[in-house]
Interface confidence: medium
């Protein structure tokens, strides 16, 4: 019996289409595949950012695969051909590995890249990113922000920079159509007559950096002699009610502070007839049903009741 062998894929490479971290891994079929024409040849692909402990592994019949990477680090990948057992009348046959790497040659020292990059998607409507200039860079240094997400033909540059002392220190983004629930890639690079500036790459999903507006229309209603219902309305904007969590802070007679987290726009408070003053504030955050993370809104305006029988009056601010 002659041992069945198969060659590794040819021309295995990582292709950067200019999408700031979204890369193509591509290869060509191995030589001498015609012996297995009746067979579905598969490829096992492993890849990772250099420094990562774990490989991502996929098995595919295609000749390409796409994924997002951190371009602040290098990328390594390897691939081999798989012949399923059905093709070989026995066990699965694997080729040797073909390997490739990719990295962007870094310019400038790490300290020149932007510091403290912070991006917030205000009320799921307006994306704003801000940063501080690199350490020790001169005033002639300017930073430029580029972004891409699936749906754009190519990476776009920020057109509305926030400036301080003539330097770009942030970007106000335009309306970003169909941009949530997918990776959003950013590169901030820089230029200086004095010295090269290191680029920085960032990836996040917009729904995970949403900072909603605070809730509005806070009200009290006496439900019974010992219960008061606190109510509020969701903030104006595109975020549906099902996406909110709320945190309430309640102060009774300047003594008791109650803090609670709730999923609905109401909270029932146990109280006594002796309560002379009641104040509460609420803030909102996108919940786990709509995102993996989020930022608490600012607190709402404070709503207080003072010196009247709550059973006789509903207060509306």
């Amino acid at each position: 019996d002659t041992e069945i062998k198969v060659n590794p894929p040819q021309d295995f490479e990582i292709v950067d289409p200019g999408y700031l971290g979204y890369l193509y891994l591509q290869w060509q079929p191995p030589l001498s595949l015609d012996h297995f024409k009746e067979c579905t040849v598969e490829y096992e692909l492993k890849y990772r950012n250099i420094g990562s402990e774990t490989w991502k592994t996929i098995i595919t019949k295609n000749l390409h695969y796409k994924d997002g990477f951190d371009l602040n680090k290098g990328i390594e990948a390897k691939i081999h051909t798989l012949l399923p057992w059905q093709c070989t009348n026995g066990s699965e046959v694997q080729s040797s590995w073909a390997e490739t790497t990719y990295w962007i040659s870094p310019q400038g020292i790490p300290e020149t890249k932007v510091q403290d990059m912070d991006c917030v998607y205000y009320n799921w409507q307006y994306l704003l990113c801000s940063w501080k200039p690199g350490i020790g860079v001169l005033l002639d240094t300017n930073y430029n922000l580029f972004y891409w997400y699936e749906g754009l033909d190519h990476a776009l540059q920020c057109v509305d920079y926030i400036k301080a002392d003539g330097q770009n220190i942030g970007c106000r983004f335009p309306y970003l159509e169909a941009s949530d629930y997918k990776d959003f890639y950013i590169c901030v690079n820089g230029s200086s007559e004095n010295k090269p500036i290191r680029s920085s790459y960032f990836t996040f999903q917009l729904q995970n950096i949403v900072k909603p507006l605070p809730p509005v229309y806070l009200t009290f209603t006496r439900e019974s002699s010992c219960e008061i219902k606190l109510k509020w309305s969701i903030p104006l904007g595109p975020i549906p009610a099902r996406c909110f969590d709320y945190e309430i802070e309640i102060r009774e007679d300047d003594t008791t502070l109650v803090t609670a987290t709730v999923e609905n726009e109401t909270y029932t408070l146990k109280t006594t007839n002796e309560t002379r003053q009641l104040c509460f504030v609420v803030r909102s955050k996108v919940n786990i049903y709509c995102s993996d993370d989020g930022i608490w809104s600012e607190w709402s305006d404070k709503q207080c009741w003072e010196g009247e029988d709550l059973s006789k009056k509903t207060l509306l601010r």
Partner: antibody
């Protein structure tokens, strides 16, 4: 419509240089290997050079090795052939061709440009 | 390097005829052979790849067969638009060479 359009051909003296360009449209350029194939007047087809989809792998015919350089710019959907130390025998129509790829085969040429004529003569 | 020897170099035929062109590789190329049609003054056009697979939009009167070193290309019923030069090419490994061509002329 998938299209390849060559440019840059012309008359050049022996020992001279020329740069051919090929503009691609109608397909994802970065997904395919690309080649140059030439045809001398009244003769058959001769493969010249191939560059892989990402540009990492390059292959040349022995007849042009060391004189010609193939390159690509995926951002511009463009393929190039830099021809130096040209000889009379390099006179030909130069075609830009896309490398077809199926799950089991590759390196055939499934889309061709209209060609650009290079004449090397004193 | 793998050489591709194509025969005949030319042939005369009439509309409706069956035409066969052969190509012999100097070493085993599996089924990695393509066939092209070139009309004078035009770019070549892919007809067959991997010895027997028709390219998109190619009429079924064109067919290919063979493996290893011997390959055939057949036009089952020659049409007026088929008078052209036909080339074989191996797409096995670099350098990717063409046959010398077969000119199909009107009898």
């Amino acid at each position: 419509e998938v299209q390849l359009v060559e440019s840059g051909g012309g008359l050049v003296q022996p020992g001279g240089s020329l740069r051919l360009s090929c503009a691609a449209s109608g397909f994802t350029f970065s997904r395919n290997g690309m080649s140059w194939v030439r045809q001398a007047p009244g003769k058959g087809l001769e493969w010249v050079a191939t560059v892989s989809s990402g540009g990492s792998y390059i292959y040349y015919a022995d007849s042009v090795k060391g004189r010609f350089t193939i390159s690509r710019d995926n951002a511009k959907n463009s393929l190039y052939l830099q021809m130096n130390s040209l000889r009379a025998e390099d006179t030909a129509v130069y075609y830009c061709a896309r490398q077809g790829t199926t799950a089991l085969a590759t390196r055939f040429f499934d889309v061709w440009g209209q060609g650009t004529l290079v004449t090397v003569s004193s | 390097d793998i050489q591709m020897t194509q025969s005949p170099s030319s042939l005369s035929a009439s509309v409706g005829d069956r035409v066969t062109i052969t190509c012999k590789a100097s070493q085993d190329v599996g089924t990695a052979v393509a066939w092209y049609q070139q009309i004078p003054g035009k770019a070549p056009k892919l007809l067959i790849y991997s010895a027997s697979y028709r390219s998109t939009g190619v009429p079924d009167r064109f067919s290919g067969s063979g493996s290893g070193t011997d390959f055939s290309f057949i036009i089952s019923s020659l049409q007026p638009e088929d008078f052209a030069t036909y080339y074989c090419q191996h797409h096995y490994s670099a350098p990717w060479t063409f046959g010398g061509g077969t000119k199909v002329e009107i009898k």
